[in-house]
């Protein structure tokens, strides 16, 4: 009996530019002889329904139809037909099919590959055209994929040390698509510094599918207006 097992759940998520290994494990009742077996990997794009050959391995020969694509002969010996794709790109997301032939048997499995890009976040103070005692803080998130992103603002005071979400005076702009397919967005927080306590810590919180934990950038309101704290300068740009 010949069986193929792919990533549990049927989906693999990988960071943009990563060297991804798309899993495909072979289960066979006898020891594998790699000189008498065949492995073919196919890819079907998210945008069109045509299947394309990515890599094939037959006995003493292997061929990559996508530069750098490889199945390890040394791992194949122990039943691992996983496909390594170095420098994965956004457009390479889609369905991957692993087809294994141990004559006369054939088995296959499919997996969806999602490619994500994590946002970089930075805080800026915009002083241009602002009224007296007014500050505009901008939280720029850039280079993320997919487009869906959630940006919120929180504050912590000495009185209330637990973060409180700010809903007023927050404007989040439209997402802008970059040439490489990733996205940028900017969220703005308008503050009236005369009405806020010095020492209040403000945080821009970015949540995205590519992040295990939210990305947090913070600044502390100081007595001297328009001065950004050391916390913001040193800790919060990624």
């Amino acid at each position: 009996d010949l069986k193929v097992e792919m990533m549990a759940g049927g989906t693999q998520i990988t960071p943009l530019n990563d060297n991804v290994t798309i899993f495909c494990n072979i289960f066979y009742s006898q020891p594998l002889n790699i000189t008498s077996m065949g492995i073919t990997w196919f890819w079907k794009s998210l945008t069109f329904d045509k299947e394309v050959k990515v890599f094939e391995f037959f006995g003493d020969h292997q061929e990559a139809f996508r530069p750098g694509a490889i199945v390890s002969p040394w791992r194949l010996k122990s039943g691992d037909a996983s496909l390594r794709l170095p420098g994965i790109q956004l457009e390479e997301a889609g369905e991957y099919r692993c087809e294994v032939v141990v004559t006369p048997l054939k088995a296959q499995g499919t997996v969806q590959l999602e490619v994500v890009a994590s946002p970089a976040s930075r805080l800026l103070l915009d002083q241009v055209g602002m009224k007296e005692n007014e500050d505009k803080y901008m939280c720029e998130s850039s280079g993320f994929y997919p487009e869906a992103i959630n940006i919120t603002w929180e504050k912590q005071t000495q009185k209330f040390p637990h973060p409180i979400e700010i809903s007023e005076d927050v404007i989040t702009g439209p997402t802008i698509k970059n040439m490489d397919g990733t996205f940028n967005v900017t969220s703005c927080l308008k503050l009236n510094s005369s009405q806020e306590d010095p020492g209040t810590v403000y945080q821009c919180v970015v949540r995205h599918a590519s992040l295990h934990t939210p990305l947090r950038s913070n600044f502390t309101l100081t007595a001297a207006r328009h001065s950004l704290s050391e916390t913001e300068k040193t800790d919060n740009f990624s």
């Epitope: 290994t21 494990n25 490889i70 040394w74 791992r75 691992d80 390594r84």
Partner: antibody, heavy 120, light 111 residues
Framework: EVQLVQSGAEVKKPGASVKVSCKAS????????MDWVRQAPGQGLEWIGD????????LYNQKFRGRVTLTVDTSISTAYMELSRLRSDDTAVYYC?????????????WGQGTTVTVSS | DIVLTQSPDSLAVSLGERATINCKAS??????????MNWYQQKPGQPPKLLIY???TLHSGVPDRFSGSGSGTDFTLTISSLQAEDVAVYYC?????????FGQGTKLEIK
């Protein structure tokens, strides 16, 4: 920085078993196989086998088949080599080594070695 | 099993001179256009250190006085200008077939 840190020296009696650990850090554990190689005093190098942390698949040198068991715990990036029914000629330094498997096959980083002495 | 025979067993070379170590395989270690022959250096009390893989590719951080050549069954490790720190035992290893096998080693000393 890639590091492989092996467990300490062992002294065993003939017939006993020994289990050597190899803790990996500084790289993605599942991207490389782990080779095990031994070296008897004053002798050359001898390949015991390797394990693929991706699926737990193992390849053994026939000479050790039935006596050696290679395992991994991916949650702590650690590989293990257990050798049973020890004999005096199993006295050697046992090495784990990270093994590239996609673009060639070679052991590019080695553990410091674990001395196993089998003596009655 | 593929048997690897190194020659010579030991070698004494003057500082600054060329050192050459040969490795002969009992059958070809070539596969799909590549040669699966690696070279390691081992100093007393230390683990082996990778020098050359795929017959001729220098491992990162290895000085370029080390070079490897050959294909099929005959391979050579060359040190173009021997340095004091090159005193060690050198091993060839094939990784084409299991079990992966090593040569018996060549001890390199300073003359």
């Amino acid at each position: 920085e890639v590091q492989l840190v092996q467990s300490g020296a062992e002294v065993k009696k003939p017939g006993a078993s020994v289990k050597v650990s190899c803790k990996a850090s500084g790289y993605t554990f599942t991207d490389y196989n782990m080779d095990w190689v031994r070296q008897a005093p004053g002798q050359g190098l001898e390949w015991i086998g390797d394990i693929n942390p991706n699926n737990g698949g193992t390849l053994y040198n026939q000479k050790f088949r039935g006596r050696v068991t290679l395992t991994v715990d991916t949650s702590i990036s650690t590989a293990y080599m257990e050798l049973s029914r020890l004999r005096s000629d199993d006295t050697a330094v046992y090495y784990c080594a990270r093994s590239e498997v996609f673009y060639g096959n070679y052991a590019d980083y080695w553990g410091q070695g674990t001395t196993v002495t089998v003596s009655s | 099993d593929i048997v690897l025979t190194q020659s010579p067993d030991s070698l004494a070379v003057s500082l600054g001179e060329r050192a050459t170590i040969n490795c002969k395989a009992s059958q070809s270690v070539d596969y799909d256009g590549d040669s699966y022959m690696n070279w390691y250096q081992q100093k007393p009390g230390q683990p082996p250190k990778l020098l050359i893989y795929a017959a001729s590719t220098l491992h990162s951080g290895v000085p370029d006085r080390f070079s490897g050549s050959g294909s099929g069954t005959d391979f050579t490790l060359t040190i173009s200008s021997l340095q004091a720190e090159d005193v060690a035992v050198y091993y060839c290893q094939q990784s084409k077939e299991d079990p992966r096998t090593f040569g018996q080693g060549t001890k390199l000393e300073i003359k």
